[in-house]
């Protein structure tokens, strides 16, 4: 169990800042598994703070190893039955100590949130959570307080009156050999799977179930607007009329009723009617990883951290996987170096984001007088006579492509090629058929196409000459 710098995240740092010794404490918050994991939502299942906290001192130039967690357990009492699925929020807070602290200074070092599934009475579950440059190793479990037992702490047990057997009609409580199931005190018909009771003749429902006997899934309930079915009737009631019902105190504050109203006892670092205001200001240096603190210049104004690219969270404590945004174009490989992103480009591409196509005409010229032609996302060189290859760098045999049509003979020449045409043809490439009577030449049809009617063709051609 430790809190310290994660692997590969640079030189470990002491959690204390420049103002001398500090100590860490932990706030554990439980939220229903179905609730939003947003910071604002209440710790509806319960919250608690660590108590015994060792003091850490800053030793300049010395690396901070993983810090031991405070001794002892953080106990979070939960209301009603244990839901099985829940959100676990663990915040690591720093308290600045000493004469240079300038009064109590609290700020959030790290906050980890995770959805968890856990039955009550099971073994310790181990976990590792990373956030920003910190890593938290911890264990957690859920236990029922006697006389409750079971995965949801919904069954009541009591000690056996005799070592060998339970009373008439009562079964032993598993997995507790020395205890018996308590006599059924719940309302008759209360669902043994989805209901439980703490007082005689009541039937309280586990999460997801409703109705007088907890037999109706929540989605099919006819009660609207947060109302729940009333006991032994079809009417609907507003849940919990007590001022502390639903715990109006935010951030782990504990609620107490005072003459029809409520009062919140706020944990360290928070204040306000509902503990909704953080006592941290910019003076406490709450922004991590190079974040800039905006606002919070006096105790009544909240601060906001503007995070450098690559970090997020209310205190810039969370590292963003910037490569997940796929910033590298054209199939480039993304590397997040922490201080910057790098793209390793595929062959033929360049630029900070591989955005430059070296195969386009802007990237490279064609040699030996060739001209660049773009098309279909690539480029090719149209080479001058006597040259060939990808960049027109190779000397070419101009006659290799058989450029002379209709049986003309090709002769290589210093300036290119010369075609000696077969009888009846003329033109630079012997492309024109010559009429015997000396009329206009007719371009020969490309191979594979039907020859056009020469009379009609010539008629139009002559028309243009008038």
């Amino acid at each position: 169990h430790s809190f310290g710098p994660g692997p590969g995240l640079g030189t470990p740092r002491s959690p204390c800042n420049a103002r001398g010794p500090c100590r860490l404490f932990f706030r554990v918050c439980l939220k229903p598994g179905v609730s939003q994991e947003a910071t604002e939502s209440l710790c509806a299942l319960g919250a608690a703070l660590s108590t015994s906290v060792p003091v850490y001192t800053e030793h300049p130039g010395e690396s901070a190893a993983a810090l031991p967690l405070p001794d002892g357990l953080v106990r979070v009492p939960f209301r009603d039955a244990w839901p099985g699925t829940f959100s676990l929020v663990i915040e690591t807070w720093r308290e600045q100590l000493g004469e240079h602290a300038g009064g109590p200074a609290w700020n959030l070092l790290a906050r980890v949130v995770g959805r968890r599934r856990l039955a009550a009475g099971g073994p310790w579950a181990r976990d590792v959570q990373r956030t920003g440059t910190w890593e938290l190793h911890f264990s957690y479990r859920a236990r029922c307080e006697p006389p409750a037992v079971g995965a949801a702490c919904a069954r009541l047990c009591r000690s056996r009156s005799a070592p060998s057997r339970c009373g008439p009609g009562l079964r032993p409580c598993t997995p507790f050999p020395d205890e018996c199931e308590a006599p059924s005190v719940c309302r008759p018909g209360c669902s043994p799977e989805h209901g439980y009771c703490e007082e005689p003749d009541e039937c309280r429902c586990l999460e997801g179930w409703t109705g007088p006997l907890c037999t109706v899934p929540v989605s099919t309930s006819s009660c609207l607007n947060s109302r729940v079915p009333g006991p032994a009737s079809t009417g609907c009631l507003l849940p919990g009329p007590g001022p502390c019902d639903g715990n109006p105190c935010a951030n782990g504050g504990s609620c107490s009723e005072t003459s029809g109203s409520f009062e919140c006892a706020c944990p360290r670092g928070f204040y306000g009617l509902r503990c909704e205001v953080s006592g941290v200001t910019c003076a406490d240096g709450p922004c991590f990883n190079g974040g800039l603190c905006v606002g919070g210049e006096d105790p009544d104004s909240a601060y906001v951290c503007h995070c450098p690219p690559g970090f997020q969270g209310s205190n810039c404590e969370k590292r963003v996987d910037r490569c997940s945004l796929q910033p590298c174009q054209n199939g480039g490989l993304c590397l997040d170096l922490g201080h910057a992103l790098r793209c390793r480009c595929r062959a033929g591409f360049a630029g900070p984001r591989c955005e430059h196509d070296l195969d386009d005409c802007a990237g490279r010229a064609c040699a030996n007088g060739g001209t660049c032609v773009e098309g279909g996302g690539s480029r090719r060189c149209s080479c001058a006579l006597g040259f060939g290859g990808r960049d027109c760098r190779e000397r070419a045999d101009p006659c290799a492509s058989r450029p002379c049509a209709h049986g003309g003979r090709c002769y290589a020449h210093f300036s290119g090629l010369v075609c000696a045409c077969a009888p009846g043809y003329m033109g630079v490439r012997c492309e024109f058929a010559v009429r015997p009577d000396g009329a206009d030449a007719v371009p020969a049809a490309p191979r594979g196409l039907r020859q056009a009617d020469p009379q009609r063709f010539l008629h139009h051609h002559h028309h243009h000459h008038h």
Partner: antibody, heavy 118, light 108 residues
Framework: QVQLQESGPGLVKPSETLSLTCTVS????????WSWIRQPPGKGLEWIGY???????NYNPSLKSRVTMSVDTSKNQFSLKLSSVTAADTAVYFC????????????WGQGTMVTFSS | EIVLTQSPGTLSLSPGERATLSCRAS???????LAWYQQKPGQAPRLLIY???SRATGIPDRFSGSGSGTEFTLTISRLEPEDFAVYYC?????????FGQGTRLEIK
Amino acid sequence: QVQLQESGPGLVKPSETLSLTCTVSNVSISSYYWSWIRQPPGKGLEWIGYIYYSGTTNYNPSLKSRVTMSVDTSKNQFSLKLSSVTAADTAVYFCARLSNWGFAFDIWGQGTMVTFSS
Amino acid sequence: EIVLTQSPGTLSLSPGERATLSCRASQTISSSYLAWYQQKPGQAPRLLIYGASSRATGIPDRFSGSGSGTEFTLTISRLEPEDFAVYYCQQYGWSPITFGQGTRLEIK
């Protein structure tokens, strides 16, 4: 290498609005915060504000009521508008890039001198 | 806002000597959030040091930064002719971002 180039008028009449543009080369404007800083003749540096491509801005409170910044990602440019200018706004105006490990200025433009006079 | 006060206003030294420039903050700054710049006439400032003690890319190792809390120092171990310029400190932990008024380092 990354380059920043300021552009805009060198002379602006008092009470008018100054408009400057900074063109960014060889890096995507979406990857960093971008800032404006000014320096009156013979004096020190004054931070004006910064902007991120997402639209996040932060302005110096002393200038906030007169400053507007914007980003054009398609042109890889960001701009500054300073309204109701006076002779006291005469300065060299620099655009700069904020580093990715904190809000220090790691790349600067060469600056453009703007004088406010009728 | 955090006010940064630099001292001395002007420092006259010879090449080869050691220069020590001071920057004092009106409130505590996390040591991660202080930078130093060098500016020569007619040029833009150049980042030398960030995070109070980390050298920026391409900065010679004769430049070093130190300090924490409210007291920060820039040291140039052996002055070269090209080091004579104006030096500014800047804090970037708390908005508004602020600069010191500068220290002019001149040839004696």
